[in-house]
């Protein structure tokens, strides 16, 4: 039988919210770093 994609892993379901928050936090930090870099330039 075909292996399920990662979205079917129970872990995906249980960690979806925290992983989404972590990703958003990462993106915010990246944007902040980019702004700082632009200021320096």
């Amino acid at each position: 039988s075909e292996e399920p994609p990662i979205s079917l892993d129970l872990t995906f379901h249980l960690l979806r919210e925290v992983l989404e928050m972590a990703r958003a936090e990462q993106l915010a930090q990246q944007a902040h770093s980019n702004r700082k870099l632009m200021e320096i330039i």
Epitope: E3, P4, P5, I6, L8, D9, L10, T11, F12, H13, L14, L15, V18, L19, A22, R23
Partner: antibody
């Protein structure tokens, strides 16, 4: 069949780092999260964190945040757990584990003993 | 963190007799999706843990039917209907409903 084969035992000095590997086979590596759990001698089990081998999303147990780094190499279906600034109470067997659509730790590696001693 | 408390710490058993292990969570471990992510693991001496039961009462593939799980809310039980020699070892309950995921302290099942 699903197999998780871990690297061999390590002896480290306090303050050093250790990197444990976990080679997966018998399934599509990117289809399942990889977790890490540790067990101090004669003690219980402690969940350390989880990594999504597909996208690289990582979530660490707050207790280990700042000291643990989990990575994967998709090309060789291998997960890694690096623990830095080792202390004597980090002496433990470190396990990698994979879940299913129904349970979180359905398959386990054989464990890697890390001994921290001066 | 959700504290998982197991009792007894040590359980002396007679082969062929039943055994029961209790696990209590410090708060309800019913997830927001209405499921209870309570699992039981067996660790034989010198071996890696092995999944026995998931979602309170479901046996994982290959697990003998002498193992059964029950409970709800904060009180859970693992029962072995007739203990066999291969059942000796340490049993851990685990909750995956709340972050961080946490294990109980373990119950050692040994020969009386």
């Amino acid at each position: 069949q699903v197999q998780l084969v871990q690297s061999g035992a390590e002896v480290k000095k306090p303050g050093a780092s250790v990197k444990v590997s976990c080679k997966a086979s018998g399934y599509t590596f990117t289809d399942y999260f990889m977790k890490w759990v540790r067990q101090a001698p004669g003690q219980g089990l402690e969940w350390m964190g989880v990594i999504n081998p597909n996208q690289g999303d990582i979530f660490y147990n707050q207790k280990f945040k700042g000291r643990v780094t989990m990575t994967v190499d998709k090309s060789i279906s291998t997960a890694y757990m690096e623990l830095s600034r080792l202390r004597s109470d980090d002496t433990a067997v470190y396990y990698c584990a994979r879940g299913t659509d129904r349970a979180l730790f359905a398959y386990w590696g054989q464990g890697t003993l890390v001994t921290v001693s001066s | 963190d959700v504290v998982m408390t197991q009792s007894p710490l040590s359980l002396p058993v007679t082969l062929g007799q039943p055994a029961s292990i209790s696990c209590r969570s410090g708060q309800s471990i019913v997830h927001s999706d209405a499921n209870t992510y309570l699992e039981w693991y067996q660790q034989r001496p010198g071996q890696s843990p092995r999944l026995l039961i998931y979602k309170v009462s479901n046996r994982f593939s290959g697990v003998p039917d002498r193992f059964s799980g029950s409970g709800s809310g904060t009180d859970f039980t693992l029962k072995i209907s007739r203990v066999e020699a291969e059942d000796l070892g340490v049993y851990y309950c685990f909750q995956g409903s709340h972050i961080p995921w946490t294990f109980g302290g373990g119950t050692k099942v040994e020969i009386k």
